[in-house]
Interface confidence: medium
């Protein structure tokens, strides 16, 4: 028997520095977790203790903090090189700055193979990107061979900016021939490493003949065997065992997100490459693990540029940006309109001639808007200003909801109106009218939504049975502020870009902004 240790991360999302327990900015260092310096300490400790170790990343290193905003992926290549990752799969967020924003900072600079078998380049891009990412890589580990085959969510064109010269194929269809090719090369230990979410990971384990282990990402799935060490609730045991169609037991793993845990899986193979046993658990990277001083020093060196960036002007406002609680928790506020407009603008994807865009709607809990911005400071807007407005380090995500769920959400928005509670929704691509004289749960008297399958966008009444795409904060997608109906009834959820980054990019693009209060939210006469 031959034993392999797989160390794995996924959905790190730019958390190069240690974070608080909820993966936001570290405040009390003695209670902070994760970060590349701490990860390196643990990885090296395991490399020293065990003979056959692979360090793998299942995608979405890009996007999530000011680190990515400023360094645009150069930080990912630099620190993944320093940690000596063995391979990485492309995630959807790796395309957030377009293909060029992937090629230059990461693909050309990484000293480890970057993989995806189901992304096919065409046209002029094919020669430009040739060899910079691979469908698979055979790695020497000790005296054995391990094949790593990559995959990426086929939804990426709707979630990011891969352009028109990359085709995202069905994962299973694309993986099978690559695995077959590895078998012909006498590679009998094969890991599928990819970024399509836990459901697809399980399908790959079930359907792709010859895959021995699946290491996934995208769905931020936390798996654990035994008593979990922090706040995350396990979605199943680690590893999650899938019985393949040809009767093999295939371990499937994921390691939550944000670099909070290091996935640790031990696999035992027989001489024919069959998995005999698999066991392990994610390792919580808490403060009991010291940060490596060399990596930490490097982090501090790179940090200097971030501090300078946060005070630079992104753009100007010529109007007061009203992000006050008195406004945003009670009525339409222009800060809410600005943020929602930025959220929609960030999700412009012309992927189908029948649609002007794939999504037109935004909802945003008023309680998530934490500060106004005064235009009387020469109109200047900085990252620092926006961090005061959106201090929680969340993301603006894409969900699919039925009209009936949206109606419930808007009823919840005003079910206890008047108490300055955070659930009052700011909107984009939606016209809502409330009648507060009616009883809670029946206060939405009009709800019109902007069409997407149209050449000239216009507002149509919401249809209860239709499925709609909506951009919203991850906080709402996870049922925050009492929006349990969203969490329980959403049909699809894909995590998006860092909230501040979305707004800052929009402001930089517009240069001068002047959002108005324009009648997106109305109250029927006599009720307000």
């Amino acid at each position: 028997a031959w034993e392999l240790t797989i160390l794995h991360t996924n959905d790190v999302h730019s958390r190069l520095e240690q974070t608080s327990e909820d993966s936001s900015k570290c405040v009390n260092a003695s209670r902070c977790m994760g970060g590349v310096a701490r990860l390196f300490t643990k990885v090296q400790q395991i490399r020293r203790a065990e003979p056959n170790v692979l360090l793998l990343d299942a995608g979405d290193q890009y996007q999530g903090t000011i680190w990515f905003t400023v360094y645009k992926g150069a930080e990912v290549a630099h620190f993944m090189n320093a940690l000596r990752y063995d391979a990485m799969a492309l995630g959807n967020h790796e395309f957030d700055n377009g293909v060029e924003g992937l090629i230059e900072p990461l693909l050309k600079e990484a000293k480890f193979p970057i993989l995806s078998a189901n992304i096919k380049a065409k046209g002029p891009l094919a020669s430009q990107i040739s060899g910079l990412y691979l469908p698979y890589k055979v790695l020497p580990v000790g005296d054995e061979v391990v094949g790593i085959v990559g995959y990426t969510s086929k939804e990426t064109p709707f979630l990011s900016n891969p352009g028109t010269n990359l085709v995202f194929e069905d994962e299973i269809t694309a993986l099978q021939p690559e695995v077959d090719k590895l078998k012909t090369l006498n590679v009998n230990k094969i890991i599928a490493l990819g970024h399509s979410g836990f459901e697809m990971d399980k399908l790959i384990a079930q359907k792709v003949r010859g895959v021995d282990v699946v290491v996934g990402g995208h769905s931020n799935t936390f798996l654990y065997t035994g008593n979990p060490p922090s706040k995350e609730v396990p979605a199943g045991k680690y590893p999650f065992i899938v019985t393949s169609d040809d009767g093999r037991k295939v371990p499937v793993v994921q390691a939550y997100a944000f670099g909070k845990y290091l996935g640790y899986l031990k696999i035992e193979f027989d001489e024919r490459g069959n998995v005999i046993s698999s066991h392990g658990n994610p390792i919580l990277l808490n403060s009991s693990i010291p940060e490596d001083p060399s990596i930490k020093a490097d982090i501090n060196k790179w940090r200097i540029k971030l501090d300078n960036y946060s005070t630079q002007e992104l753009g100007k406002t010529i109007v007061y940006l009203d992000g006050s609680s008195q406004s945003c928790r009670f009525r339409e506020c222009n800060m809410g309109n600005l943020i929602c407009d930025a959220m929609i603008n960030n999700n412009l994807r012309h992927t189908d001639e029948m649609f002007w865009n794939h999504v037109s709607m935004c909802i945003l809990n008023g309680g998530g808007i934490r500060s106004p911005i005064d235009e009387r400071n020469n109109g200047t807007i900085t990252w620092e200003n926006l961090a005061a407005v959106l201090p929680f380090g969340g993301t603006f995500d894409l969900v699919q909801l039925k009209g009936s769920t949206l109606k419930k959400a808007f009823e919840h928005s005003v079910h206890r109106y008047g108490q300055s509670t955070g659930e009052f929704l700011q909107v984009g691509g939606i016209h809502v009218v409330y009648d507060l004289s009616r009883k809670p749960g029946d206060r939405v008297v009009k709800l019109d939504v902007l069409c997407t399958k149209c050449r000239v966008p216009s507002y149509d009444p919401l249809k209860m049975d239709e499925v709609y795409k909506v951009i919203l904060p991850n906080f709402l997608a996870n049922g925050g502020d009492g929006f349990q109906m969203i969490k329980d009834e959403l049909l699809r959820h894909d995590s998006g870009d860092q909230d501040i980054n979305v707004v800052s990019t929009y402001i930089s693009k517009m240069k001068v902004i002047y959002p108005a209060v324009e009648g997106r939210i109305k109250f029927s006469t006599g009720s307000h």
């Epitope: 320093a82 990484a110 000293k111 480890f112 020497p140 061979v145 090369l185 490596d292």
Partner: antibody, heavy 121, light 107 residues
Amino acid sequence: QVQLVQSGAEVKKPGASVKLSCKASGYTFTSYDINWVRQATGQGLEWIGWIYPRDGFTKYNEKFKGRATLTVDTSISTAYMELSSLRSEDTAVYYCARKEGYRGDWYFDVWGQGTTVTVSS
Amino acid sequence: DIQMTQSPSSLSASVGDRVTITCRASGNVHNYLAWYQQKPGKAPKLLLYNAKTLASGVPSRFSGSGSGTDYTLTISSLQPEDFATYYCQHFWSTPWTFGGGTELEIK
């Protein structure tokens, strides 16, 4: 430009130890492995081991384990190789070489000029 | 340990000749193979890696091929500066061994 500069020639007696240095410049020292390779006169090349300067992680050729010790001083971007219990067959030119990549593309892309070690009684 | 056997051990050729040097590994090294050129009194110089990728600044007359256990270095048209000793090296399982070398001399 990127270069590795090695210390001068050494003459040692059998049983003694020798410590060779390799000073790097023109690149980030902590980002690349430093390997050591030797070549006896008129002979081929023999790999001794490598060290990752960022944290001193080492890997040795079993043949040299226990006799060769690889270390670094990152403050002066210098790698060292100490070889103990010298015998006459250790007489050779010793090279340090930078290794590119990790498990991606592997090769020695930059070499030092070599240090001649002579072991003689 | 994987042994690397180079052939021939020495070779005489003329300027303009096409020359082929082979390297056989005792086990599959999966293209993790580099070729170096060494001149007397000098350190080796990288020519190719991954069996066939030309290193930066190396003339295109040098090329590599092969897979599994058998690899070849070809010089399409010998130039005066190409007379030297050539070594292959595998980067599979440690120790990373070198071939015995091929001395290329002027005929």
